[in-house]
Amino acid sequence: IVKAGITIPRNPGCPNSEDKNFPRTVMVNLNIHNRNTNTNPKRSSDYYNRSTSPWNLHRNEDPERYPSVIWEAKCRHLGCINADGNVDYHMNSVPIQQEILVLRREPPHCPNSFRLEKILVSVGCTCVTPIVHHVA
Amino acid sequence: IVKAGITIPRNPGCPNSEDKNFPRTVMVNLNIHNRNTNTNPKRSSDYYNRSTSPWNLHRNEDPERYPSVIWEAKCRHLGCINADGNVDYHMNSVPIQQEILVLRREPPHCPNSFRLEKILVSVGCTCVTPIVHHVA
């Protein structure tokens, strides 16, 4: 997911950085800009219940991380839900995972110093056909 | 998703910051620490094809963003795929979306100055019942 080594023409108005760790250590403004102006994420909030592979959302809190709260999906069933509302064991509910970037306080408990960290989170579940290995 | 206003006992070894923008502007080490040591994200890489709500992955590249490459899921069908491989008109494929944090170069083209940005990405697709039947 992460690719950062792109040469960019430097803007003369950039903050100066002669830090020996540059470009590893950068300045980040935590005043979040939200690009999701045209989308309402709440509209998909009931999919977890209506999916054929429904999931529950578990709160994962860590004050040493930014954001400190992340919601993790856990599939409710091993199989998928059929039209009758029963579990179909011929199909599998599986988590859809995504690697995301978070900020980890480093050194610990420091309010203004972070390190970028990659974590794997389960966002929701999908219903898949199991892989059947045919024996000759 | 984001919650940052937590009081943390300050570590005396923290870098000093008397910046007037503090705590909005922080130092971040871009040397990514990967916590996913026990997980193999490739294991879910074929779910996009085996799901009853399959999806394609589209590359979204932006050199002004960190990470510069993000993969976006687009559901292949409006309906879901049944056991025969045909569309089931009674079910819908929908994207599972997640708000993630990225770093946006600010001012533009600056290699060492960023602003935190929240964007909504589609991670995969799930199969849902279109109508919720409310029982009296």
Epitope: - | H77, L78, N86, V87, D88, Y89
Partner: antibody, heavy 120, light 107 residues
Framework: EVQLVESGGGVVQPGRSLRLSCAAS????????MSWVRQAPGKGLELVAI????????FYPDSVKGRFTISRDNSKNTLYLQMNSLRAEDTAVYYC?????????????WGQGTLVTVSS | DIQMTQSPSSLSASVGDRVTITCQAS??????LAWYQQKPGKAPKLLIS???SLETGVPSRFSGSGSGKDYTFTISSLQPEDIATYYC?????????FGGGTKVEIK
């Protein structure tokens, strides 16, 4: 140029049958979902039947279920609608329409329509 | 079935006027909405799908917006060739259903 041409309409008595055809040209017929949509005189549009690209999935609303059958012959680039047990309320212009995708959800090309009149 | 309530059923406006048509679904249709134009004696023509996506070749004066149950179709500057009946159609839940239509006339 995409073209859809319906045929087979006419006047028929209640209880009788009729078969409509839609000849497609100008696109790869076998990769598109198709539908029949009807419009009673002076009225709005009503879905009649849907079929996916390979004929493996179909759908009918309750108003025609059990009486109408949609089918396709991809080797002949033709869509069909078999209408049995016709009723006066089936009187309408019948359009065949193409979905821009495999399945038949919304319609980017329509034929000119064929009029079916059910009357004694 | 999902009911699509379109309003007004007819309207009369002058050339150059901004024209707005609304379509309300009986439940959330998650942006799965199409808009069609039908001229007298002709087949419908697709203008917009996905609530907002303009079809190729459709003039930019036509636009769609909305979410959830409520959707809007706008002609930013009415032209004489826009005289027609306009229909919305949901494709979230079968059977796909159409609004009753809005007949647009020139004053």
């Amino acid at each position: 140029e995409v073209q859809l041409v319906e045929s087979g309409g006419g006047v028929v008595q209640p209880g009788r049958s009729l078969r409509l055809s839609c000849a497609a040209s100008g696109f790869t017929f076998s990769t598109y979902g198709m539908s029949w949509v009807r419009q009673a005189p002076g009225k709005g549009l009503e879905l009649v039947a849907i079929i996916n690209h390979n004929g493996g999935s179909t759908f009918y609303p309750d108003s025609v279920k059990g009486r109408f059958t949609i089918s396709r012959d991809n080797s002949k680039n033709t869509l069909y609608l078999q209408m049995n047990s016709l009723r006066a309320e089936d009187t309408a212009v019948y359009y065949c329409a193409r979905d821009p995708r495999h399945d038949g959800y919304f319609f980017d090309y329509w034929g000119q329509g064929t009029l079916v009149t059910v009357s004694s | 079935d999902i009911q699509m309530t379109q309003s007004p059923s007819s309207l009369s406006a002058s050339v150059g006027d901004r024209v707005t048509i609304t379509c309300q679904a009986s439940e959330d249709i998650y942006d799965r909405l199409a808009w069609y134009q039908q001229k007298p004696g002709k087949a419908p023509k697709l203008l917009i799908s996905g609530a907002t996506s303009l079809e190729t070749g459709v003039p930019s004066r036509f636009s769609g917006s909305g979410s959830g149950k409520d959707y809007t179709f706008t002609i930013s500057s009415l032209q004489p060739e826009d005289i027609a009946t306009y229909y919305c159609q949901q494709y979230w839940s079968v059977p796909w259903t159409f609004g009753g239509g809005t007949k647009v006339e020139i004053k």
